[in-house]
Interface confidence: medium
């Protein structure tokens, strides 16, 4: 922060410490980051809110990160930019406070946030049986609700009223930082806080995935060849369930039964986010069963996201029993991390010949299974999964580390940073809010068909893209 | 903003000295590491000396080790540069500079307006 006095006059000028070119160029560099992130975060939380397949609970994390984000493109970026290249603060300092708070408040937000992901994704791999049960909207919304608050609390009070701590604003007027800042160590023990916990926790959590998803796969790779299809014929059912008077499976059904198939847990509970639109669609899954229920003689066929009904032996009486054939993933909507291996099940029938034909489609069904599979087999989706986690984490270190190693350095050698350095490394901070929406949302085939839909103004049936 | 009001310089015979005092209108004067520096006419501004914020630790040119001593009154919010033996090439415009080094925003740094220094042979 380069300010001077002019010497024609006695008041001070503050000036730029920019050429107009490079005031230009900075404005026009930053103002494209704000822009983006901008665009990417709202793209996000829309998606979300218009399309119910977006709307579960690992996209719930995602909206939260999201927020923040979009705060950091609005507020964070745009007032560090005017800061930088006006070369000192215009806007006084309760703005400076508030603007300080806010920012600090925000990132830590959205890094906890990110932390949330991790630990979700955590106990998706290493709880596949017990943590589904838990994970339900109303324990993301705490979750989300914690980082927020935690965040706020950590840092609003002590940047806002430090001032009236120990009795004196030590800010200059035309400066803008965090008065208890002026201690290195109090600006390291920050980063530790900030930073190289996150990292810490995140590197080991994401170690723990990547090491769960590889021994999935060696485990896969040991088994026969034929549970390589996409649904194994070990794990199909084909169970009577009594029908209630919703023509639907009773109580009885619902997560469950989806924990323990054949007496061993399922193969393959990868963690949704980027292989979201891959798993929960089966499309594939759906069109062949469509075929098998249509060969049979009298048929109704309704398809409903992952359910193939077929309405067996018409009758006039309106209470008339149904056979429901479903397949695919039985997760609640809320949640997103459950086992995905395909399920069948037959609903009672009681029509004519309802027992015989319903043997005949689970028959068919479990024929259907056992034929080469057209998909690439598990251990490429694990490795996706993998892949996208370690995206996610080298985005984060790469854009906080270069800022967070300034304030180490700093603590030892106060002058060893040149201005510039510190503010491409604060900025650096900042692109992390452009990048998240990219590495957590575009690499989901659903969000990114929502994502193209609203930016070519296609809101017809937007809300069930998939 | 902080503001530096340099003063105490004028027109001297060369082995005479000479006292300049740098004014400081800053809340939090003790965080600022002091310096003078002085431009020569047609040449380039270049430092002369500087204080650590606490005092501890000065810095000189070499064309003046010996002969220039820099000291600070917190109490006060001034610099001092106390120049002796003064030579016809210490002759300048002297400047007072502030900076204030904060962890994670950088530098802080402010000039004065400057003071006449002549010293004649």
């Known amino acids: 922060m380069n300010n001077s006095t002019n010497s024609s006059n006695n008041s001070l000028a503050l000036t730029s410490p920019y050429k107009t070119f490079e005031v230009v160029f900075i404005v026009l560099v930053a103002g494209s980051l704000s822009l983006v992130t901008i665009i990417g975060n709202i793209l996000v939380m829309v998606s979300i809110k218009v399309n119910r397949h977006l709307q579960t609970v690992n996209n719930y994390f995602l909206f939260s990160l999201a927020c923040a984000d979009l705060i950091i493109g609005v507020f964070s970026m745009n007032l560090y930019t005017l800061y930088t290249v006006i070369g000192y603060w215009p806007l006084g300092p309760v703005v400076c406070d508030l603007w300080l708070a806010l920012d600090y408040v925000v990132s830590n937000a959205s890094v906890m946030n990110l932390l949330i992901i991790s630990f979700d994704r955590y106990f998706c791999v290493t709880k596949p049986l017990t943590y589904p049960v838990k994970r339900t909207t109303k324990m993301a919304g705490m979750m989300i609700a914690a980082a927020w608050v935690l965040s706020f609390i950590l840092w609003a009070p002590a940047i806002l009223f430090w001032q009236f701590i120990v009795g004196v604003r030590t800010v200059e007027d035309g400066e803008c930082y965090i008065q208890f800042f002026s201690n290195a160590a109090v600006t390291f023990g920050t980063a530790i806080a900030a930073f190289y916990l996150p990292v810490i926790i995140m590197t080991v959590l994401y170690w723990h995935i990547s090491r769960a998803s590889k021994s999935r796969i060696k485990k896969d790779k040991k088994e026969p060849v034929a549970n390589q299809d996409p649904v194994s014929p070990s794990l199909v059912q084909g169970r009577i369930v009594k029908p209630n008077n919703n023509n639907m499976p009773s109580s009885d059904d619902g997560l469950e039964h989806n924990k323990i198939q054949n007496g061993k847990a399922p193969r393959d509970p990868v963690t949704e986010n980027c292989v979201q639109g891959e798993e929960k669609e089966s499309s594939n899954d759906s069109t062949s069963v469509s075929a098998v229920a249509s060969n049979m003689r009298d048929d109704e066929i309704t398809q409903d996201e992952n359910t193939v009904s077929t309405s067996l032996g018409h009758s006039k009486d309106e209470n008339s029993k149904q056979t429901c054939i479903r397949i695919g993933t039985k997760t609640p909507k809320s949640d997103s991390c459950t086992p995905t291996n395909t399920t069948v099940e037959v609903v009672g029938s009681s029509g004519q010949n309802g027992d015989e034909k319903q043997n005949i489609v689970a028959r068919k069904i479990v024929k259907m299974t056992k034929q080469p599979a057209k998909k690439k087999p598990p251990p490429s989706r694990e490795k996706k999964v993998t892949r996208t986690i370690l995206a996610i984490l080298l985005a984060f270190i790469i854009t906080w580390a270069p800022y967070n190693v300034m304030v180490l350095i700093n603590t030892f050698c106060a002058p060893c940073i040149p201005n510039t350095v510190w503010t491409i490394g604060y900025w650096l901070c900042y692109i992390n809010s452009t990048i998240n929406p990219a590495c957590y949302a575009l690499c989901n085939a659903t969000f990114k068909k929502t994502f193209k839909h609203l930016l070519m103004c296609h809101y017809k049936n937007i809300g069930a893209t998939r | 903003q902080v503001q530096l009001q340099e003063s105490g310089g004028g027109a001297v015979q060369a082995g005479d000295s000479l006292r300049l005092s740098c004014a400081a209108s800053?809340?939090?004067?003790?965080?600022?590491?002091m310096g003078w520096f002085r431009q020569a006419p047609g040449k380039e501004r270049e430092f002369v000396a500087s204080?650590?914020?606490?005092?501890?630790?000065?810095q000189y040119a070499d064309s003046v080790k010996g002969r220039f001593t820099i000291s600070r009154d917190d109490a006060k919010n001034t610099v001092y540069l106390q120049m002796n033996n003064l030579k016809p090439e210490d002759t300048a415009v002297y400047y007072c500079?502030?900076?204030?080094?904060?962890?994670?925003?950088?530098?802080?740094?402010?000039w004065g307006q400057g003071t006449q220094v002549t010293v004649s042979s």
């Open positions: 800053a809340r939090s004067f003790v965080s600022y590491a």
């Open positions: 500079n502030a900076v204030k080094y904060i962890p994670g925003r950088g530098e802080y740094d402010y």
């Open positions: 204080i650590s914020w606490s005092g501890t630790m000065t």
